[in-house]
């Protein structure tokens, strides 16, 4: 048995007569043979669940659920209750109604076995019938909403009449009906005004019924019509077995370049028309087990369960359902030498499902793990300016498919054939497993005999020590020009275009800083700034070369303070700035300020 509502409301007036009917509570059956019996909690409660007094005023008919006044609630009784309400004005009291024998002790009042009945207290006598407005004659102030469990026997769940009004104003004629489309499973009996279900409901067909209750009251020779929403929610039970959408029970996957722990290798989706068990219980009650196979597979893979609520269309309305994604995930990094093919089976069990049929599914994953070979092109040819500054990025080396790699740790090294011309360095980028070539020794670069640099690039997989090699030929171009005196170490210091472009700075491939003109649109990613190379700085990312020295690109790498209009980068640098941003790496400070339009003109005039 269960209540069709978790709360009821009615009004109480001073000196209302004993015997006045107040309202009906309704219970619905879970099984056809059940017979409801209602029991009132012993106490009246007030604000913040304060227990006020033993209930001596209101009784219930155990078989019908009718609550009525056993004795009149006079001023002194109300004063008595008010005193115990922790100093708050007592406007509302409530009672607990239990369904026997569900709850035998008065504890927490939880639906479905308990409902609260709230009484709004009015410190006046019941108003004259003629003064009652149609709204007051028709419906309680608080709109009811109803809960009906699916697949349960039909039954009465509401009675429209306001009993105190009917009792005290018998000459007022009130009629009710439900506005609903054809074929809906509800009926309002014209004589008793009881609302009942015509048949058992199916939540998977319809979950919410937004009905409208219509009340018609005589007003002279006219009728006033009052309409209120009458929402019914159908509560779910686990009556649907899990299924495969479109019958897909097998997923095939190839593990090749993505070999990192936690990589999702394949996903299979399971659909369940139910939304129970609820999210808190779901993972415990909806289990997935990777069936024992070989030990290697058990150690290498795990299954992750990702349930998600979705909505599906049923009979023109949307109802909630659950999709369960079962992801086959790498439990560890896989070596590039691994080479296997296997079939994995996962048992999914909806343990709450009662049938008919089984709540169990078998998921199949066909997995091929392919080995990865390291290949480099036979030769790389690059050029570098003699004016390039230290940490200038001049190119990239990359084993075949390196951009696609994850979980593969490749290290790059350079072996110089001419010991005195060892100008370049290489660092491995964590992002795409490439090697970034940069100027490491500017002195060697300026030597006239170092016009052509020959290197061997060696790529090594750290786990297996497998290697790949390539020739690297670097042509040194241009002639060296000494920098003007007083130029800062970092391009980022310069605040104006002219001073920016006449100096060089760490990381500059041409020996000159570059000015990036912003778009001037408030706090923007495209702020104006001075950079060693606009290709790499700023780009919102502090790369592996830029980490070598804070002077290269503080716009991307600074961890210090940024003054002025800006949005900080994650985890460092300037994500967006206002106007022009310049930085003082030694002081660990950047400034973003409005652009000074007159500056270039002044610079020209002052020359």
């Amino acid at each position: 048995l269960y209540f069709s509502r978790d709360a009821y409301w009615e009004k109480l007036y001073v000196d209302q007569a004993a015997g006045t009917p107040l309202l009906y509570v309704h219970a619905l059956r879970d099984a056809p043979e059940e017979v409801p019996s209602f029991r009132l909690g012993q106490h009246l409660y007030g604000t913040y669940r304060t227990r006020l007094h033993e209930n001596n005023w209101i009784c219930i008919q155990e078989d019908t659920g009718l609550l009525y006044l056993n004795r009149s609630l006079d001023h002194s009784s109300w004063e008595k209750l008010s005193v115990r309400n922790r100093g708050f004005p007592l406007l509302t009291v409530y009672l607990k109604v239990f369904l026997s024998p569900t709850s035998l002790r008065e504890g927490e009042c939880q639906w479905p076995g308990c409902a609260r009945v709230y009484f709004s207290f009015f410190n006046t006598s019941f108003p004259a019938c003629s003064s009652l407005k149609p709204r007051e004659l028709c419906f309680p102030e608080t709109r009811p909403s109803f809960r009906i469990r699916e697949n349960r026997p039909p039954g009465t769940f509401h009675q429209f009449r306001l009993l105190p009004v009917q009792f005290l104003c018998p000459n007022i004629s009130v009629a009710y009906r439900l506005l609903e489309g054809e074929g809906l499973p509800f009926r309002c009996a014209p004589d008793s005004l009881e609302v009942s279900t015509r048949w058992a409901l199916d939540r998977e067909q319809r979950e919410k019924y937004e009905l409208v209750a219509v009340c018609t009251v005589h007003a002279g020779a006219r009728e006033e019509v009052v309409m209120v929403p009458f929402p019914v929610t159908v509560y779910d039970e686990d009556d649907s077995a899990p299924t495969f959408p479109a019958g897909v029970d097998t997923a095939s996957a190839v593990v090749e370049f993505k070999r990192k722990e936690d990589t999702v290798v394949a996903t299979l989706r399971v659909f369940d028309a139910d939304v129970v068990p609820a999210s808190g219980e779901l993972v415990r009650r909806y289990t997935s087990t990777l069936l024992p196979g070989d030990t290697w597979a058990q150690q290498t893979f795990r299954v992750e369960h990702w349930p998600n609520e979705t909505s599906v269309q049923a009979n023109g309305s949307f109802v909630r359902a659950t999709v369960h994604d079962y992801r086959l995930v790498l439990n560890r990094n896989l070596s590039i030498s691994e080479n296997r093919t296997m079939q994995l089976a996962v048992l999914v069990n909806d343990s709450d499902f009662q049938g008919p049929g089984a709540g169990v599914l078998l998921l199949h994953f066909n997995v091929s793990v392919l080995p990865v070979s390291l290949h480099l092109p036979s030769t790389y040819s690059l050029s570098v300016s003699r004016r390039a500054r230290r940490f200038a990025q001049i190119g990239k080396v990359c084993v075949e498919n390196c951009q696609a790699f994850s979980g593969i740790n490749v290290q790059y090294k350079l072996h110089s054939s001419g010991a005195n011309c060892s100008t370049l360095g290489v660092v491995t980028s964590a992002e795409d497993t490439s090697g970034i070539l940069f100027v490491n020794d500017t002195k060697a670069l300026r030597r006239p005999k170092c016009a052509e640099l020959h290197y061997m690039v060696v790529a090594t997989d750290q786990q297996t020590s497998r290697q790949a090699q390539a020739q690297l030929l670097v042509t040194v171009e241009g002639s060296y020009v000494a920098e003007e005196a007083g130029c800062p170490l970092s391009c980022a210091v310069s605040k104006r275009r002219l001073e920016c472009e006449e100096c060089g700075g760490l990381g500059s491939p041409t020996g000159r800083c570059e000015w990036r003109q912003g778009d001037g649109k408030g706090i923007t990613r495209n702020f104006s700034t001075c950079s060693p190379s606009t290709k790499t700085c700023p780009d919102g990312h502090c790369d592996v070369v830029e980490t070598q020295d804070i002077n290269i690109c503080p716009q991307d790498c600074l961890r210090g303070s940024i003054v002025g209009g800006h949005e900080p980068g994650e985890p460092r640098g300037i994500k967006a700035g206002y106007g022009t941003c310049n930085c003082f790496p030694e002081e660990e400070k950047c400034f973003c300020e409005p652009e000074d339009i007159q500056d270039p003109l002044c610079d020209e005039l002052c020359r």
Epitope: S130, A219, G220, A221, R222
Partner: antibody, heavy 117, light 112 residues
Framework: DVQLQESGPGLVAPSQSLSITCTVS????????VHWVRQPPGKGLEWLGM???????DYNSALKSRLSISKDISKSQVFLKMNSLQTDDTAMYYC???????????WGQGTLVTVSA | DVLMTQTPLSLPVSLGDQASISCRSS???????????LEWYLQKPGQSPKLLIY???NRFSGVPDRFSGSGSGTDFTLKISRVEAEDLGVYYC?????????FGGGTKLEIK
């Protein structure tokens, strides 16, 4: 489309009874009340009585003893019965539907009843 | 019973003129629920009456905005701002606040 249609005998002898039927379509008599109004030739409108959606009735005070209104919801019909007709009961008899609190929004076309020997 | 008295009995007007019809009740027709169920109907020769105004001042759907109703308590007025040929006929006020409801005697709007 809401429609009301009166049908009556046309001619009634003095002291005899009158029975008029109002057949409705486009709405249910369980949801709307129906009124009867008459209009003697060249005169004004006179309210006769009504039947509420619940089936209860109200009548014109002066005619109460001679009037009876009933309905058959399943047949969508409302009936007016009037006893002891006199020549001054000669009139066009209308049925009209109450549109909630907005008044007589829908009327029949009327049926002429002549009381004459 | 509530007696509804309409004046004038006949109202000759020129097309385009304003017309005003008065209706007075023998007692207040404010219902205890606060509403006043005062309506105006127009009956053209050989036709059934048509609803124009309900609850004193609300125009029924399809009624031109040259028709307006006003008043309270016991005194009510129907105004036609610019009379057109199709407005000619007999106008009736009606009170539905008290049972039995009652019609006024009617006002005939005709061409001067």
């Amino acid at each position: 489309d809401v429609q009301l249609q009166e049908s009556g005998p046309g001619l009634v002898a003095p002291s005899q009874s009158l029975s008029i039927t109002c057949t409705v379509s486009g709405f249910s008599l369980s949801r709307y009340s129906v009124h009867w109004v008459r209009q003697p030739p060249g005169k004004g409108l006179e309210w006769l009585g009504m039947i509420w959606l619940g089936g209860s009735t109200d009548y014109n005070s002066a005619l109460k003893s001679r009037l009876s209104i009933s309905k058959d919801i399943s047949k969508s019909q409302v009936f007016l019965k009037m006893n002891s007709l006199q020549t001054d009961d000669t009139a066009m008899y209308y049925c009209a539907r109450n549109l909630d609190s907005r008044g007589f929004a829908h009327w029949g076309q009327g049926t002429l009843v002549t009381v004459s020997a | 019973d509530v007696l509804m008295t309409q004046t004038p009995l006949s109202l000759p007007v020129s097309l385009g003129d304003q017309a005003s019809i008065s209706c007075r009740s023998s007692q207040s027709i404010v219902h205890s629920n606060g509403n006043t169920y005062l309506e105006w109907y127009l009956q053209k020769p050989g036709q059934s009456p048509k609803l124009l105004i309900y609850k004193v001042s609300n125009r029924f759907s399809g009624v031109p905005d040259r028709f307006s109703g006003s008043g309270s308590g016991t005194d009510f007025t129907l105004k036609i701002s610019r009379v057109e040929a199709e407005d000619l006929g007999v106008y009736y006020c009606f009170q539905g606040s008290h049972v039995p409801p009652t019609f006024g005697g009617g006002t005939k709007l005709e061409i001067k």
